[in-house]
């Protein structure tokens, strides 16, 4: 057992341009408070567990009123440490979330209004009993400076707070098999204290307060013999006497979850699903009210003024679960339109838009036909972040403003000469060719190959293409 301690040194604008506006004003004075949430492990899986190591809420800071025209300074902080007690071993690696909250003290209907100013998170390695570790984290334009440490509560010692120490019974040495406690050389390592009532014959423990059963025994205190008549859920080795599998000690044996919690095995241990009103690793913390701050990740707690009435957590977008402990992947909804890239920053959703699109969700097609006219009778064709004009005959260019030179593409075949005409172009064909584009050779006998020359038009005469 022990305590994780967090000391906030400062919360204010970070370095660089774009200093944030002060969160408080003369019209709306406010004060800050902080919330810390701890989870065991460095892995991403730790994010799924609801502050399994514990959470704490600071006191409210002094009331602050912005000086008109002044930039946001470092804001006044609450006194004292944030302390998160842990009952079991300190994991050595942990994840943290520190939230900075603003409490507005204006004329609020129904009491003060709370809003989340900043949230920082990180994953760290930390040995219990070590010195204070200093850290700086940035959230948008804000900067949070803080220190933290984990310390064991006597009689626990060690980097994980799992070794127990007792004062020496004799001044010279410790008892048989027990070492001196470093750094407290005047104390001796004590044997592990198992859960009260744990059978000394059939139970054992690897951590204080635990009671794990030897093969053939079950129950919370390992006092119940396992029935050999029905060999359900085989787990352990075969029993020589019955020739049947006897369940060995599984993590959910004897249901470690208190207060009606249901136990489910996980690859490494077990997980308790607690009924409303209870929480903690084993549902051992009871009588939860809104004053205990049971809603994580900025959830708003409603009701639960006394331990008998249930509280309800209203989760902010991006979180769900009875305590707002589960993160929703908002980017899985693909909120960024038109091929935009989604970034879930936790406190906000951001879209990085493709060229040609803008807006919070890339919903604004900058190159569409809206408000864009195609000149000279052209029509606008839009789509996919680009627009183009389909121009009327004789016009070209992006907006159909340029007069097209119909002869630019050299449309007259076989050496025919091209003339621009108000209704298009005219080809004057070289001897031996005819057609609108001089595409047909004239046969020596005067007959043309497909199609026949129009009446009154001799081969070689200019032909107008309409």
């Amino acid at each position: 057992a022990g305590v994780f301690e967090l000391q906030i040194h400062s919360f204010g604008p970070g370095p660089g341009p774009g200093a944030p506006r002060s969160p408080c004003s003369a019209r709306l004075p406010c004060r800050l408070f902080f919330r810390v949430c701890l989870k065991p492990g460095l892995s991403e899986e730790a994010a799924e567990s609801p502050c399994a190591l514990g959470a704490a809420l600071s006191a409210r800071g002094p009331v602050y009123t912005e000086q008109p025209g002044a930039p946001a300074p470092d804001l006044p902080l609450p006194d004292g440490l944030l302390q998160v007690p842990f009952r079991d071993a300190w994991p050595g690696t942990f994840s943290f979330i520190i939230e900075t909250w603003r409490e507005e003290l204006g004329d609020q209907i129904g009491g003060p209004a709370w809003s989340l100013l900043a949230r920082v998170a990180g994953r760290r390695r930390l040995a219990a009993g070590g010195p204070w570790a200093r850290d700086i984290q940035r959230a948008g334009a804000w900067e949070l400076r803080f220190s933290y440490r984990a310390r064991c509560e006597p009689p626990a010692v060690g980097t994980a707070c799992t070794r127990l120490c007792r004062p020496r019974s004799a001044p010279s040495r410790c008892g048989p098999g027990l070492r001196p406690c470093a750094p407290l050389e005047d104390e001796c390592e004590a044997p592990l204290v198992c859960r009260a009532g744990c059978s000394p014959e059939h139970g054992f423990c690897e951590q204080p307060g635990e009671c794990r059963c030897l093969e053939g025994w079950t129950g919370p205190l390992c006092t119940v013999p396992v029935s050999t008549s029905s060999c359900l859920s085989p787990r352990g080795p075969s029993s020589a006497t019955t020739g049947c599998l006897v369940p060995g000690p599984g993590p959910c044996d004897g249901n470690p979850c208190a207060n009606g919690g249901s136990c489910s095995e996980t690859p490494r241990s077990f997980e308790c699903t607690c009924p409303r009103g209870f929480y903690g690793l084993r549902c051992e913390v009871s009588g939860v009210t809104c004053a205990d701050g049971p809603c994580f990740n900025g959830g708003l707690c409603v009701g639960g003024a006394d331990p008998d009435s249930a509280y309800i957590c209203h989760c902010p977008p991006g979180f769900q679960g009875s305590n707002c402990e589960k993160r929703v992947d908002r980017c899985s909804l693909q909120p960024c339109r038109n091929g935009g890239l989604c970034l879930d920053l936790g406190h906000a959703l951001r879209c990085r838009c493709r060229a040609g699109f803008a807006g919070p969700r890339c919903e604004h097609d900058l190159d569409d036909c809206a408000g864009r006219a195609c000149a000279n009778g052209g029509t606008c064709v839009e789509g996919g972040g680009a627009h183009r004009c389909s121009c009327a005959l004789g016009f070209g260019g992006r907006d159909c403003r340029e007069r097209a030179d119909p002869c630019a593409a050299r449309p007259c075949a076989h050496g025919g000469r091209c003339y621009a005409h108000f209704s298009g172009l005219v080809c004057a064909c070289a001897p031996g060719y005819m057609g609108a584009r001089c595409e047909f050779p004239v046969h020596p006998d005067g007959a043309s190959a497909l199609p026949a020359a129009p009446p009154g038009l001799r081969p070689g005469d200019p032909q107008r293409y309409l």
């Epitope: 693909q334 038109n338 807006g359 097609d365």
Partner: antibody
Amino acid sequence: EVQLVESGGGLVQPGGSLRLSCAASGFTFSDYGIHWVRQAPGKGLEWVAYISSGGYTIYYADTVKGRFTISRDNAKNSLYLQMNSLRAEDTAVYYCARGDYDDIFYTMDYWGQGTTVTVSS
Amino acid sequence: DIQMTQSPSSLSASVGDRVTITCRASRDITKFLNWYQQKPGGAVKLLIYYTSRLHSGVPSRFSGSGSGTDYTLTISSLQPEDFATYYCQQGNTLPWTFGGGTKVEIK
């Protein structure tokens, strides 16, 4: 309970001006974008304008761009639509509607009852 | 602008009938399609958002489906309070546009 109440409608001559208001309650107004949507007599719904929760993003339909101005006062939980150079085709019932949190879907999840604007000489 | 074409423009049905309304967009709207109900008094309610997600408090007899340009609103068993006009709206690209509406009348 989420509530949106529009006001400020009335009869106005072509070329005249009108200012519509929308009073919001039952939710944290400053967390949500708000839309104005209108419905001409016997016709369907037409989106008019949108303003984001902090007022930094503003959009208008082409039919009203340059004539209408959307604004909000988060301290008063109020939304406004300033309508200038009004035309006969602006005659409609005007609704304010709340957008979804985070503008993921660009829905209009709660609507007011509407206020009637008649432009006629 | 993205045009939204709703069909049919009106339909007559009886209580208990299964009713289907379709909405076609002039280009892909990537499921950002919402459905609204408007009662004769003028009140408008969101029924379904993001093609198929039921808004809170909306009965489960309403459902939505579709993708790309084609979307459908289905009322599995029409109730007396469902006689109203239904509109689709795309939330993909500005300006937000509505379909012309489908009036569901009593047969």
